[in-house]
Amino acid sequence: IYIFISDTGRPFVEMYSEIPEIIHMTEGRELVIPCRVTSPNITVTLKKFPLDTLIPDGKRIIWDSRKGFIISNATYKEIGLLTCEATVNGHLYKTNYLTHRQTNTIIDVQISTPRPVKLLRGHTLVLNCTATTPLNTRVQMTWSYPDEKNKRASVRRRIDQSNSHANIFYSVLTIDKMQNKDKGLYTCRVRSGPSFKSVNTSVHIYDKAFI
């Protein structure tokens, strides 16, 4: 049983007017624009902002008042700002969705320090791992290091999106007052969906007498 609860001031069950809802899509797969309505007799129009109307043909694009618009075979042409519109009592209501085709490409991963790293005991270690990806890619960056069990490191992350062709993700590992137990292999691992890359560096600790 599906129950509609009619609300003339709210034609869509979920309203995304200020911040669009993001929908991840895969080309060739079904894409649902979930602008289900509070009453089955509300007429809804699907637009690719601002100029294109996507007309339900009963085959590739189907309207279902309980689900929204179902696009059976999504293409790159459905990437963008899709808006469901309904006019109720002379008022135009809109709910917005951003369709987003995510990629999982990792272009490059680097640790921006000399290899191997030579450090005096008691000093601070700073390792900067940089991952470069296409614009529509997100990554998870993790570190493994010798005294990981004691959570010796603090990690800061940031994204640089000022490049017009790529995203650059930074993960900066810092360990204060380096001890002998901190020497060894430091690995930065970068994952994006099924894609994976890693880079490592060796850290050597010295007493002043050996420098």
Epitope: S17, P20, P50, L51, D52, K77, I79, G80, L81, K94
Partner: antibody, heavy 119, light 110 residues
Framework: EVQLLESGGGSVQPGGSLRLSCTAS????????MNWVRQAPGKGLDWVSS?????????YHVDSVKGRFTISRDNSKNTLYLQMNSLRAEDTAIYYC???????????WGQGTTVTVSS | QSVLTQPPSASGTPGQRVTISCSGS????????VNWYQQIPGTAPKLLIY???QRPSGVPDRFSGSKSGTSASLAISGLQSDDEADYYC???????????FGGGTKLTVL
């Protein structure tokens, strides 16, 4: 590199006609809505016309040019057009061709072509 | 007379933060998203902010946008001399079936 290159501007007497062209390169032209925006000397930006990606019935014009200007496109030539008839002095401006962004707004602008209507 | 209303001018010193406002109505800003454009004299406009607050790649995070009801604003922090330009807000208008712009705000870096 994504580029829009306008041409066809010039000087014309009131009542005359001009046809502006905008050639696109560096992107799949047929996948994007396109627009014309103008800027009168020393003034702000004013939207003139828009056309959807297929160039079908979805064409829009600002009221002041309706019945005089027609926007069209030829996707096989990667070209956008603006046919301007019955030109008036107030149509004097730089005309920019612009591409719609996937997610709203006009993300690519041409360098503009100047139209001067004067007797 | 522009459909969207902006102050004609704004100014600030290097390093300062300045805000430019843009007001409209339900049929444009109230029911649609806002974009901001930067136009350096003698050049074509450039998209600065889209979807109210999103920056295209290449735009520094010193630029930020916001929207509330039928008004929007553009904030520029850490003002630099090369920010001196005209700034325009824009939105789609459901009644006019077209784009509408603000009259533009001339930003001067003192």
């Amino acid at each position: 590199e994504v580029q829009l290159l306008e041409s066809g501007g010039g000087s014309v007497q009131p009542g005359g006609s001009l046809r502006l062209s905008c050639t696109a390169s560096g992107f799949n032209f047929e996948d994007y809505g396109m627009n014309w925006v103008r800027q009168a000397p020393g003034k702000g930006l004013d939207w003139v016309s828009s056309i959807n990606r297929n160039g079908d019935i979805s064409t829009y014009h600002v009221d002041s040019v309706k019945g005089r200007f027609t926007i069209s496109r030829d996707n096989s030539k990667n070209t956008l057009y603006l046919q301007m008839n019955s030109l008036r002095a107030e149509d004097t401006a730089i005309y920019y061709c612009t591409k719609n962004h996937d997610y709203h707004g006009m993300d690519v602008w041409g360098q503009g072509t100047t139209v001067t209507v004067s007797s | 007379q522009s459909v969207l209303t902006q102050p004609p001018s704004a100014s600030g010193t290097p390093g300062q933060r300045v805000t430019i406002s843009c007001s409209g109505s339900r049929s444009n800003i109230g029911n649609n998203f806002v974009n901001w454009y930067q136009q350096i004299p003698g050049t074509a406009p450039k998209l600065l902010i889209y979807l109210n607050s999103q920056r295209p790649s290449g735009v520094p995070d010193r630029f930020s946008g916001s929207k509330s009801g039928t008004s929007a604003s553009l904030a520029i922090s850490g003002l630099q001399s090369d920010d001196e330009a005209d700034y325009y807000c824009a939105s789609w208008d459901d009644s006019l079936n077209g784009w509408v712009f603000g009259g533009g705000t001339k930003l001067t870096v003192l």
